[in-house]
Structures are given as C-alpha cells and as structure tokens.
C-alpha cells in the first residue's frame, strides 16, 4: 500500500510558544443587557500560548500579556432599521510563554 512506501517522519514536539488563535467576540463582551444585536467581525486573531511541556506537572502558561483594544461594529435594530454603532473590545495577547508548575499563579500585566 501507499502507506508502506512512505517513510514516517520523526514526531516533533509542539513546543510551548505563542501561536495565532481565533477568538470569538461574544455579544456579552459588548452588552450583557441586550441580545438584539450582532457583532462584526464575529471573530478575530489573537496570540495565545500553547504547546506541550516535558511532564504533566507543568503547563504552558503566559509570562507576559498585553491588552489590545480593538474597534468592532455593533449592529442594532432601531425603528426597524439596522444601525451600526462602534464598540471597543479589549483582547488579550500573550507575548511570552513558559512551562510553569500547575500551582503557579498567573502573571499580572
């Protein structure tokens, strides 16, 4: 079969580092009291720590984070008409990561 002809490459560990992830902008981040609106865009890219550590007692955690305000559009219905309003959502980007013991507290910005 085709599988027996291909040589398996060595597995590489997904190291603990920042990676681009998709973050969903939920409506409750913008307005907890009203459900009759949409948010655009519905998702954005953020940098987040992910990957494996050498043993189970440690986890890939951010050691440095940065808050990034972005402007989104809130689409509301006013007198039957869709009206766009600007809203600000604060995203959290991870700048640096480290394998830390599970009990370790998260860093403060």
């Amino acid at each position: 079969s085709l599988g027996s002809l291909t040589i398996a490459e060595p597995a590489m560990i997904a190291e603990c580092k920042t990676r681009t992830e998709v973050f969903e902008i939920s409506r409750r981040l913008i307005d907890r009291t009203n459900a009759n609106f949409l948010v655009w865009p519905p998702c954005v890219e953020v940098q987040r720590c992910s990957g494996c550590c050498n043993n189970r007692n440690v986890q890939c955690r951010p050691t440095q984070v940065q808050l990034r305000p972005v402007q989104v559009r809130k689409i509301e219905i006013v007198r039957k008409k869709p009206i766009f309003k600007k809203a600000t959502v604060t995203l959290e980007d991870h700048l640096a990561c480290k394998c830390e013991t599970v009990a370790a507290a998260r860093p403060v910005t």
């Epitope: 039957k80 869709p82 009206i83």
Partner: antibody, heavy 123, light 110 residues
Framework: EVTLRESGPALVKPTQTLTLTCTFS??????????VGWIRQPPGKALEWLAN???????YYNPSLKNRLTISKDTSKNQAVLTITNMDPVDTATYYC???????????????WGQGTTVTVSS | DFVLTQSPDSLAVSLGERATINCERS????????VSWYQQKPGQPPKNVIY???QRPSGVPDRFSGSGSGNSATLTISSLQAEDVAVYFC??????????FGGGTKVEIK
C-alpha cells in the same frame, strides 16, 4: 417569485383623498422582517419615500407628509393600502409599492418593486 | 435630517469604459447604515443593483460594484454596456429617517 402590483384611480381632483392598494404575492406580511413601502416619483424627478408598514403592524411615515398619510395592511388578502388626503396637483406622480426586509442579519433594502401606477391631480 | 447628494447629475461614458457615481451624505457617517443603489430605465420601476453597501443581488452583472467610507458612497460600473443606460439612485437612512433617496444620476453613452 415575488410580485407587487399597485392599483388606484388614475385621476383625482384637488382636495380629494387618494387610496392606493398594493397587492403582492411570493411573500407574506406576517413573516418576521417583512415590510411594504410606498414610494412616489413626480414626472422627470427623483424618488420620494412615503411610508412603510411592517409584519408587526409598525408604521413609519415621511415626516414632511405624515399628517396626510395613512398606511394599513390586510395580511389575509396580501395587500397594503396607502391613503393620501387633501391631494394637490404637486402630488401628481407615479406611485410605487416595494417589498422591504429588515433584521439584524438582514439588509434594509427594497428588493422587489411594482410597475407603478400613475396618478394625476387635476380639476 | 440629512440629504443624499449625487454627483454628477449626468454622465456620458464610452462603451467599455468605467462609470463612477458618487453619493454624499450631508451629515453623519455613511458607514453607520447600509447604502443601496437602484437602476431605473425609462418607463420602468427602479431595480436594486447594490445593497448592503457592496452586495450584488443575484442576476446583477459583476461589472456593478459598490463601496463607501466616511460620508460618501460610490457605485462603479467597470465596463459600461448599452443596457446600463439608466438613471441611478442611491438610498440610505438613519435611526430617525426611514428612507432617503439621492437626486439621481443619468448615465448615457458617449
């Protein structure tokens, strides 16, 4: 297929009341987000919006004509009716009805129009 | 209240050339609402050619495109065809005013 058709008198006298009927098919005015609007166009001029009526019976009028306009609907007959009181020669125009839809995930657009009915105001 | 001012009033373009129509809003940001464009040929009702600022209804050729920013919106016909000869109207609204039309732009063949 969505179709709309306007009907009413071709000629009215000044001070009279004009009643126009829009009969439509292919959609229902009981469906969430659906509305019917009335628009007019004097000969060789621009379009002018008159009134909208919505699925929930909300009604909106052009502020400059509001005291002369009444819009209503008969959902069972698939009709929307516009009345204009105290007609004047400046109201001579082609009158159109159009389907309009709205909603937070929709667009506020008149996506289907009737052929229009020409109304002349003269004594 | 606001006014939509279209420019130019009329436009003569050679077949295959680009036609651009501007629609300027007197107050408020055009990006706060949707803009639609309508094509009206002589003796016919208006027909929607652009909705939601830049969306094209099915059946409308892709030579028609819409855009907008700040206080103005633009309709572009990338390669004018004989059947595009018509009057074009922009339309918008705001939270208080339900529907406002521009004054229209007549597109002809040069």
């Amino acid at each position: 297929e969505v179709t709309l058709r306007e009907s009413g008198p071709a000629l009215v006298k000044p001070t009279q009341t004009l009643t126009l009927t829009c009969t439509f098919s292919g959609f229902s005015l009981s469906t969430f987000g659906m509305g019917v609007g009335w628009i007019r166009q004097p000969p060789g001029k621009a379009l002018e919006w008159l009134a909208n009526i919505w699925w929930d019976d909300d009604k909106y009028y052009n502020p400059s004509l509001k005291n002369r306009l009444t819009i209503s609907k008969d959902t069972s007959k698939n009709q929307a009716v516009l009345t204009i009181t105290n007609m004047d020669p400046v109201d001579t125009a082609t009158y159109y009805c159009a389907r309009i839809s709205t909603g937070i995930s929709s667009y506020y657009v008149m996506d289907a129009w009737g052929q229009g009915t020409t109304v002349t105001v003269s004594s | 209240d606001f006014v939509l001012t279209q420019s130019p009033d009329s436009l003569a373009v050679s077949l295959g050339e680009r036609a651009t129509i501007n629609c300027e809003r007197s107050s408020g940001d055009i990006g706060d609402t949707y803009v639609s464009w309508y094509q009206q040929k002589p003796g016919q009702p208006p027909k929607n050619v652009i909705y939601g600022n830049d969306q094209r209804p099915s059946g409308v050729p892709d030579r028609f495109s819409g855009s907008g920013s700040g206080n103005s919106a633009t309709l572009t016909i990338s390669s004018l065809q004989a059947e595009d000869v018509a009057v074009y109207f922009c339309q918008s609204y705001d939270s208080d005013i339900d529907i406002v039309f521009g004054g229209g732009t007549k597109v002809e063949i040069k």
